[in-house]
């Protein structure tokens, strides 16, 4: 049903009534684009640090993967964990940070002319909500290896950031993912690894570009927790 899908798309850390029932499968939870909410076209972020429960990598942010927080831990208790940087150990591609992939148990750069031609995945939009095409064509999209010879341009459907051309990342757009521009200095960013800003936003942003990190804007330090603005800033 839509609610079960939207359960992972809700604003989860706002005070009631906006964040009351979220995070419980089957509850009447509804979607909003990430941690955006109305108020003079401002993009507002929340700074509470809470692990976000997940069932699969796609439920986490672009810089996270889904796993048990303890080695050999209960498989039924999984949360979004920070992605692994280059040269760190891994078991699958999703564990590695954007721009890397898992090779022989180690995260390595995917920029070294790497091409995952063996990938053939099918995205089936089987959610409870209606996914109609504007022209009435099929809703089933198969991403075959042929698509990966040229990296996805802006707006192309993708599975992960390494499918996108340089300067783009794979970010959520409704219930699909498309290549969007990596954020530049001064652009508003979403602080990941926080409950409620976990990457299943309907309109998800990319991460900050090389040499930048998502930090609270200096002149917003005095603002309340619920209205802290994060921007991409030089390290």
């Amino acid at each position: 049903t839509l609610n079960s899908v939207l359960n992972s798309n809700a604003i989860k850390n706002l005070p009631p009534p906006l964040g009351g029932a979220a995070g419980h499968p089957g509850s009447a939870v509804s979607a909003a684009p990430g941690i955006l909410y109305p108020g003079g076209n401002k993009y507002q972020t929340i700074d509470n640090y809470q692990p976000y429960p997940c069932a699969e990598d796609e439920e986490c942010g672009t810089d996270e993967y889904c796993a048990s927080p303890t080695r050999g831990g209960d498989a039924g208790v999984q949360i979004c964990l920070a992605c692994r940087k280059r040269r760190k150990r891994c078991m699958r591609h999703a564990m590695c940070c954007p721009g890397n992939y898992c090779k022989n148990g180690i995260c390595v750069s995917s920029d070294q002319n790497h091409f995952r031609g063996e990938i053939e995945e099918t995205i089936t939009e089987s959610f409870g909500n209606d996914h109609s095409t504007l022209d009435g064509y099929s809703r089933r999209t198969t991403l075959s290896s042929k698509m990966y010879h040229t990296k996805g341009q802006e707006g192309s459907v993708c599975l992960r950031s390494s499918d996108c051309a340089s300067g783009l990342c794979c970010a959520r757009h409704f219930w699909s993912k498309i290549c969007k521009p990596v954020l530049k200095e001064g652009q508003v960013c979403t602080k990941h690894r926080r409950k409620g800003s976990h990457g299943l936003e309907i309109f998800q942003r990319c991460y900050c570009g090389e040499g930048l990190s998502c930090r609270i804007q200096k002149d917003h330090h005095q603002a309340s927790n619920s209205s802290r603005l994060h921007t991409c800033q030089r390290h």
Partner: nanobody
């Protein structure tokens, strides 16, 4: 900066219809898509319908499927929500939001829809 302005809300009897409009101005980048959301007192904000210019798809919440229709014109920076067979539970402030290619997301100020029984 993109400004979104909703209009078309009002008071209507159950079973009636309303057509909401959302106009975007100040856009210097293209939009990937736009969506309608609603927030009723004491409830979480809820996704209602969306339209992706990029993917050529429309999306609907179960609660409005078959009653509401989203449409729009990306070139004119406008999106519409045709609401038929309205129910009292559709009463809420309706907001439109935009997914912009300048990496920003924008919200309108909302328009009140009240459905009396």
């Amino acid at each position: 900066e993109v400004q979104l302005v909703e209009s078309g809300g009002g008071l209507v009897q159950a079973g009636g219809s309303l057509r909401l409009s959302c106009a975007a101005s100040g856009r210097t980048f293209s939009s990937y898509g736009m969506g309608w959301f609603r927030h009723a007192p004491g409830k979480e904000r809820e996704f209602v319908a969306g339209i992706s210019w990029t993917l050529g798809r429309t999306y609907y919440a179960d609660s409005v499927k078959g009653r509401f229709t989203i449409s729009g014109d990306n070139a004119k920076n406008t999106v519409y929500l045709q609401m038929n067979s309205l129910k009292p539970e559709d009463t809420a402030v309706y907001y439109c939001a935009s997914d912009e290619s300048d990496a920003a997301n924008y919200w309108g100020q909302g328009t009140q829809v009240t459905v009396s029984s």
